[in-house]
């Protein structure tokens, strides 16, 4: 029988070089063998490019479209083919569907006695428009204390967060992860960065003093 698209492709752009399109088929599909997503910039003399999708679960497919860079006027036509059968036709304006790249290199610095310093890297180069527009959310939680989970919103440009060590329990491990969004581009949140684990060994001065005399 003929193949059918159950859930039409939806695409997001990283506003740099890649747009990711996901969709669901009506039944189990070998996406890379059976399907092709053709995309073409609607502009003078632009050629059609082919994306070979990958499986994303039994009926899901995902395709990573290379787009060099993106400007606000860019618009792409999308054609999903199964051999000679056109399954779906649509269009996609990357600037209107932006999902930033995830921040990287999340590091926890505990060498400052009373502060936990978290730093991470902006996922964009300085010449990208999103570079100076990203704000972040840092999620800190503890596997030892399941009740503890906090989100810290970082609304300034510098990719750092300082937390007083005294606000965390001593003698247990914590994890942190960070994600980004760009307010002026009305983006969705990025994926979370890989998490980083650290051990909070900080003790209050009076607690140390008390400990010392007993």
């Amino acid at each position: 029988g003929s193949m059918k698209v159950l859930q039409e492709p939806t695409c997001v752009s990283d506003y740099m070089s890649i747009s990711t399109c996901e969709w669901k088929m009506g039944g189990p599909t070998n996406c890379s063998a059976e399907l092709r997503l053709l995309y073409q910039l609607v502009f003078q003399s632009s050629e059609t490019h082919t994306c070979v999708p990958e499986n994303n679960g039994g009926v899901g497919c995902v395709c990573h479209l290379l787009m060099d860079d993106v400007v606000s006027m860019d618009n792409y036509t999308l054609d999903l083919w199964a051999g000679q059968q056109l399954l779906w036709k649509g269009s996609f304006k990357p600037s209107e569907h932006v999902k930033p790249r995830a921040p990287g290199n999340l590091t926890v610095h505990t060498n400052v006695s009373d502060t936990v310093l978290l730093t991470w890297s902006n996922p964009y180069p300085p010449d990208n428009y999103l570079y100076n527009d990203l704000t972040y959310a840092v999620n800190i939680w503890s596997e030892n204390d399941p009740a503890y989970s906090r989100i810290h919103n970082v609304t300034y440009l510098k990719p750092t967060l300082r937390i007083p060590a005294s606000t965390l329990k001593s003698g247990i491990s914590y994890r942190a992860r960070v994600r980004a969004w760009a307010q002026h581009y009305n983006t969705t949140w990025s994926e979370w960065s890989p998490s980083t684990k650290w051990y909070n060994s900080y003790r209050e001065p009076f607690e140390q003093h008390h400990h010392h005399h007993h």
Epitope: Q44, S45, S46
Partner: antibody, heavy 119, light 107 residues
């Protein structure tokens, strides 16, 4: 690092022919439109021709249409400009340039090759 | 063809000066306006594309603005290496066309 190296320039008589080449490296050549831009001695810049990433589309300035042919070899990562029926006014430094996705700007340029048309 | 009129054709300025160059298109070019820098005997270099986007590796003292038919290149604080000729170019419609150039000289 993107590198574009032109060759094939030289002195040619009016009515003669010349073939310019541009060897590209440092990027996926087959993904980008490529162009030729020229500059007559002491003058401004003039767009000559553009070819799409796969070679399906070619566009020319009116001043060279019917005389010049742009082509590319995506296996050899090389851009060409075949110039026939050359005129004195074609004398210029010819630059090959790489576009972005839109082929609206010339993002990277070669060092240029001088073509002199004179009897 | 779209005509690109650049002004001034030349200007003299000192290191540290703020310099502005304008480019007017004969019709709306929908922000597809690019700026190049060229030094004698060298190939042009792309500075700004799509009106205001800084090309990779270009110092932030260069900026672009404009819309419709009128566009501007600004150098916020002129440096010794900025003395050169600057060209605008429209990419909205074939044939692609350049402005006549602006030569920035040392005062």
């Amino acid at each position: 690092e993107v590198q574009l190296v032109e060759s094939g320039g030289g002195l040619v008589k009016p009515g003669g022919s010349l073939r310019l080449s541009c060897a590209a490296s440092g990027f996926t050549f087959s993904r980008y439109a490529m162009s030729w831009v020229r500059q007559a001695p002491g003058k401004g810049l003039e767009w000559v021709s553009t070819i799409s990433s796969g070679g399906s589309y070619t566009n020319y300035a009116d001043s060279v249409k019917g005389r010049f042919t742009i082509s590319r070899d995506n296996v050899k990562n090389t851009l060409y400009l075949q110039m026939n029926s050359l005129r004195a006014e074609d004398t210029a430094v010819y630059y090959c340039a790489r576009a972005t996705a839109r082929a609206t700007e010339f993002a990277y340029w070669g060092q240029g090759t001088l073509v002199t048309v004179s009897s | 063809d779209i005509q690109m009129t650049q002004s001034p054709s030349s200007l003299s300025a000192s290191v540290g000066d703020r310099v502005t160059i304008t480019c007017q298109a004969s019709q709306d070019i929908s922000n597809y306006l690019n700026w190049y820098q060229q030094k004698p005997g060298k190939a042009p270099k792309l500075l700004i594309y799509y009106t205001s986007r800084l090309h990779s590796g270009v110092p932030s003292r260069f900026s672009g603005s404009g819309s419709g038919t009128d566009y501007t290149l600004t150098i916020s604080s002129l440096q010794p290496e900025d003395f050169a000729t600057y060209f605008c170019q429209q990419g909205n419609t074939l044939p692609l066309t350049f402005g006549g150039g602006t030569k920035v000289e040392i005062k």
